[in-house]
Each structure stands twice: as C-alpha cells, then as structure tokens.
C-alpha cells in the first residue's frame, strides 16, 4: 500500500540567465528508494540511481547539475524552461511516487519563491 507523500518546492520562479534548485522529498513511508527520475513533460532530464548514482541526459548536460541531495539544479535559465517538472520516485515495495513543480522563468528581476505544498 502506498502511504508516502512527496513534498516539493511547489510553484517557483527564477530570473532568465540564473539558476534554480528543484527539490522533492519523500516522507511517511519506509519504502526503499531505488531511483529518482527528473522529467520535464515527457523528457527525461536526469536519473539518480541507488546503485549507479547520477546520470544526466546528454541533451541537458550543459545546463543541468546533480544535487543537492536528490534534487536537481537548472542553470542558464531561458524563458523556454518555463513549465512543469516532475520528480518520480521509484520505490520498493510501494512503487512510483510523483511530485510536480511549476517553474516560471521571468525576464524581470522580480522572481520570488512560492510556498511549499504536498502531493499525496
């Protein structure tokens, strides 16, 4: 039975040219995390595997950095980076947990961080 919840950084904004950390945290479960996928729409950005460590998709190598922790750092942001990002936790025995983050990349310098929220 899937009892866990994922807490994410929620709706966030950042300035064009800057960087942002995407963070998710899985709690309320004793399930073993075997892999975390970071995805944008249906594109795989990066994988953090319990055995192998980090793998960044070749097309994102220049602008994506692993960490901190199981999070992901996006660099040299462009307006095209605006959109939904997903952290997918593959666990045993629970299975798959998904967290959603919406990132807005702004032209101006008025970027603020949104509040945290939880996804069951």
């Amino acid at each position: 039975m899937m009892t866990g919840t994922i807490e994410t950084t929620g709706n966030i904004s950042a300035e064009k040219g800057g960087s942002i950390i995407l963070q998710c945290h899985l709690s309320s479960t004793t399930a073993q995390v075997t892999q975390v996928n970071w995805e944008q729409q249906d594109q795989l950005l990066a994988i953090c595997n319990a055995d192998l460590g980090w793998h960044i998709s070749p097309s994102f190598k220049d602008r994506v950095a692993p960490g901190p922790g199981l999070g992901l750092t996006l660099q040299s942001l462009t307006v095209n980076d605006t959109g939904e990002y997903f952290c997918i936790y593959h666990t045993y025995p629970d299975g798959t947990y998904t967290g959603r983050i919406f990132l807005e990349v702004l032209e101006s310098s008025v970027a603020e961080h949104g509040a945290r929220f939880q996804i069951p």
């Epitope: 073993q32 075997t34 249906d42 319990a50 055995d51 192998l52 793998h55 025995p93 629970d94």
Partner: antibody, heavy 119, light 107 residues
Framework: EVQLVESGGGLVKPGGSLKLSCAAS????????MSWVRQSPEKRLEWVAE????????YFPDTVTGRFTISRDNAKNTLYLEMSSLRSEDTAMYYC????????????WGQGTSVTVSS | DVQITQSPSYLAASPGETITINCRAS??????LAWYQEKPGKTNKLLIY???TLQSGIPSRFSGSGSGTDFTLTISSLEPEDFAVYYC?????????FGGGTKLEIK
Amino acid sequence: EVQLVESGGGLVKPGGSLKLSCAASGFTFSTYAMSWVRQSPEKRLEWVAEISSGGTYTYFPDTVTGRFTISRDNAKNTLYLEMSSLRSEDTAMYYCARKRRDYYAMDYWGQGTSVTVSS
Amino acid sequence: DVQITQSPSYLAASPGETITINCRASKSISKYLAWYQEKPGKTNKLLIYSGSTLQSGIPSRFSGSGSGTDFTLTISSLEPEDFAVYYCQQHNEYPWTFGGGTKLEIK
C-alpha cells in the same frame, strides 16, 4: 543488437531445485536493472523477480519469496534465477527481461527457457 | 496486488482496419501502463510505456491512451505483421502485474 539468452530449464520433481541463467550481450549489462517473468501453460504472464543494476537490491512477489533467489555477475554479463522448493504451479516458460533505464517497463526480452515441475 | 482486466481476449480484424484493446486496473495506477506484443518465434516487444509513450522503433500506427484505471491500445490501419497477442502490464507498484492477453487474428 541487444540479446538475452536463457538456459537451464528442464523437468524437475516437486520440492526440487533449478538454476536458470540469462546471458546478455549488445548493451552495458551492469547499468540496467533486470527481471525474470514467467508465462504459465495457460499463457498468463507473472513477474517473479527483479535485481538492481549493481545487484544491491532484489525484489520478489509473495508467490516466490523465500523460494527464489535472483543474482547477477556483471563481469560475466549473466543474470541468474535460483529456484528451490519447486511446486507444480511453477511450471512455466521463464523469460529474462531488461528494465528500461528510466525504470518504465521492460524493453528487451529473451526467448525463454521451459521449466516443468512434475513427479 | 493490482488486478488488470484486459478485453477482449480475442479479436478478429482485417488488414487496414483500426482496432482497440482495453485494460482496466483494480485501482488507480496513474499513467503507468505498458503494452507488449508477443509473436511465435520472436521475443516479446515493448510497444508503449507510461500509458502513451511510444517505444523507440515502434511504428506510429500504435498508440496508447488513458490514465488512472482505464487504458486503451489502438492500432490504426492494421498491417499483416500486427496479428499477434498483446499484453498490458502495470508498472506503478509492486508486484508488477499483467493483463490476460488479447489474441488478434486475421478475419
């Protein structure tokens, strides 16, 4: 070309043991999680075991827990399934399969090896 | 365990037709359903994963849709090589479970 070739199947008596092998080629074996899936004579598919890329983590359904062991030798590009206390309901074609790198589904399967448990 | 009910178990169609195969899960599996093709003398082939993502190298006449509990595999403009057995599999939670299969035969 990705290839998975199973071997080691055969006829075994109830309560007996058998060790299946799966030889992998055409990809970097040590970077993929692997599974065993079986197909009963009635053609129903059942997932029976999984192992992480480095062999650190192994997973089984309740139907085989305590009786089946999955292991791998990354130096030999080989996956194993050790089966003990075999029952007639374990009679099936056993397939090894590679799990996608993103962990979504199994993207390559072998031809299978047949296991018959009968007295 | 998540039970997967696949229908129909048998389907007859003609080349050029469009067919659909359905899978229903006993509880929500989000988008995490895969479709496989089984043909005699060939290894099982992954067609679709995560409900609607086409596996590399699979023709675009194959498509998947659905989320939650109800999923559909559609094969448009059937080719002679598409006549086979099709299985769905949930990859949302352990143990991974499969549908009972659909045998697609030439009418």
